[in-house]
């Protein structure tokens, strides 16, 4: 039977080295054996390049294409082939379809004033356009209570979030993950980073009444319990309403 595309290729670029296209066939397909995605920059002298797709699911194919450091003017011509049969043809402008790289190395450290300091790395080198454009979303959730989670927007420069221990349940295990987006590029969200987990050793201050402060906050200044953390907390239902389509 003839080979047909059910859902046309949808492509995103990390705007530094890779573009990824995904599409769905009308029946289970061995993507790498049956299909090829050719791509060529619309620029004088550019060569034609071929991407061998892989299966994401039975009928879903994905192709990762190495690209040069993207610039706004770059436009690629894409052609999807099944042997000699052209299944689909289109163009793709990386600067208009950005999906940032995933933030890395998320860690949690005890900090002054009964706070936790969450830190991660910006996934872009300083010379890349996106390095200074990223804002982040941090998701903090109780490992034993699905109802207990918080979402923070980090809109300032610097991949950090200060989190008051008092906002989390004492003695509970929490996990955090972070993702990024680039507002000026109207990007989609990056994938979530791997989670990092920690135990929240915090008791309400009134329960201490002269008792020693428990580790790991041992010896930390007791002031500023209600410090708020340079980030805007968003209620989950409100966030979900605005961002579920990502």
């Amino acid at each position: 039977g003839s080979v047909k595309v059910l859902h046309e290729p949808s492509c995103f670029s990390d705007y530094i080295s890779t573009s990824v296209c995904q599409w769905k066939m009308d029946h289970p397909t061995n993507c790498s054996a049956e299909l090829r995605l050719s791509y060529q920059l619309d620029f004088m002298g550019s060569e034609n390049h071929t991407c061998v797709p892989e299966n994401r699911e039975d009928s879903v194919c994905v192709c990762s294409m190495p690209i040069d450091d993207a610039v706004e003017a770059d436009v690629y011509q894409l052609d999807l082939w099944a042997g000699q049969q052209l299944l689909w043809s289109g163009s793709f402008q990386p600067s208009k379809h950005v999906k940032p790289r995933t933030p890395g190395n998320l860690t949690v450290h005890p900090n002054i004033s009964h706070t936790w300091l969450l830190m991660w790395t910006n996934p872009y080198p300083t010379e890349n356009h996106l390095h200074s454009e990223l804002t982040y979303m941090v998701n903090v959730s109780n490992d034993n209570d699905p109802e207990d989670f918080k979402v923070y927007n980090v809109t300032y420069m610097g991949p950090t979030l200060r989190l008051a221990a008092s906002t989390l349940k004492s003695g509970a295990s929490y996990s955090a993950r972070v993702r990024a987006w680039a507002q000026t590029y109207n990007s989609t969200w990056s994938d979530w980073s791997p989670s990092t987990t920690w135990l929240n050793y915090y008791e309400p201050w009134e329960q201490h009444l002269g008792k020693p402060i428990p580790n790991p906050l041992l010896g930390l200044d007791s002031t500023g319990l209600n410090d708020i953390f340079e980030a805007q907390k968003i209620e989950w239902h409100e966030h979900h309403h605005h961002h579920h389509h990502h």
């Epitope: 620029f43 004088m44 002298g45 550019s46 034609n48 040069d68 610039v71 706004e72 003017a73």
Partner: antibody, heavy 125, light 112 residues
Framework: EVQLVESGGDLVKPGGSLRLSCVAS????????MTWVRQAPGKGLQWVSL????????YYADAVKGRFTISRDNAKNTLYLQMNSLRAEDTAVYYC??????????????????WGQGTLVTVSS | DIVMTQTPLSLSVSPGETASISCRSS???????????LDWYLQKPGQSPQGLIY???KRMSGVPDRFSGSGSGTDFTLRISRVEANDTGVYYC?????????FGQGTKLEIK
Amino acid sequence: EVQLVESGGDLVKPGGSLRLSCVASGFTFRDYAMTWVRQAPGKGLQWVSLISGSGGKTYYADAVKGRFTISRDNAKNTLYLQMNSLRAEDTAVYYCAVDRLTKTIRPQYYGLWVWGQGTLVTVSS
Amino acid sequence: DIVMTQTPLSLSVSPGETASISCRSSQSLLYSIGYNYLDWYLQKPGQSPQGLIYLGSKRMSGVPDRFSGSGSGTDFTLRISRVEANDTGVYYCMQGLQSPLTFGQGTKLEIK
């Protein structure tokens, strides 16, 4: 030393054909696009054609489109220009030149950084 | 097609002085920040053309720093400081952004 040596220029009658060659040395020939530029007697420079490093992409000036064919043999480090249906206005010195690096996704541009010595094509009855 | 217009078409300069040649394109040659696809070439009498400047302002290998290119978008300038007798010839600008590649008419530089 990077060098380009053209040959094949001759006196030919209108409607006739000619094949120019350009032998390259001193650089990785297959990685670079190559260009032909011509200069009519007493006139300025006119671009004729370009071919990508692999030979997969070719471009032509409107004045020669359909009559001239650019090609290359990367095994022999040689660039060609096949000229058919020649006209008096094709009379010129033809230069080959090294153009952009095309082995990268976006070609890296260094201008026409090496030129050959030129070969004279005269079309006259 | 992108039309390249050079001014002046001829120029006479005394040794040691500075010569300036202008080149204007009918469309912007700026592809991305810092990447103007504009070159300058010199053709000395009886010789093949030789490259001087590429991407608007970058000197080709072996070109003395007396030669400098500037400009962006559609307006470009080649400056030759401390002109020498050896600089005589015809100077061409060329756009390398899109097919067909196009040259300016040429500027003939004469040394007094």
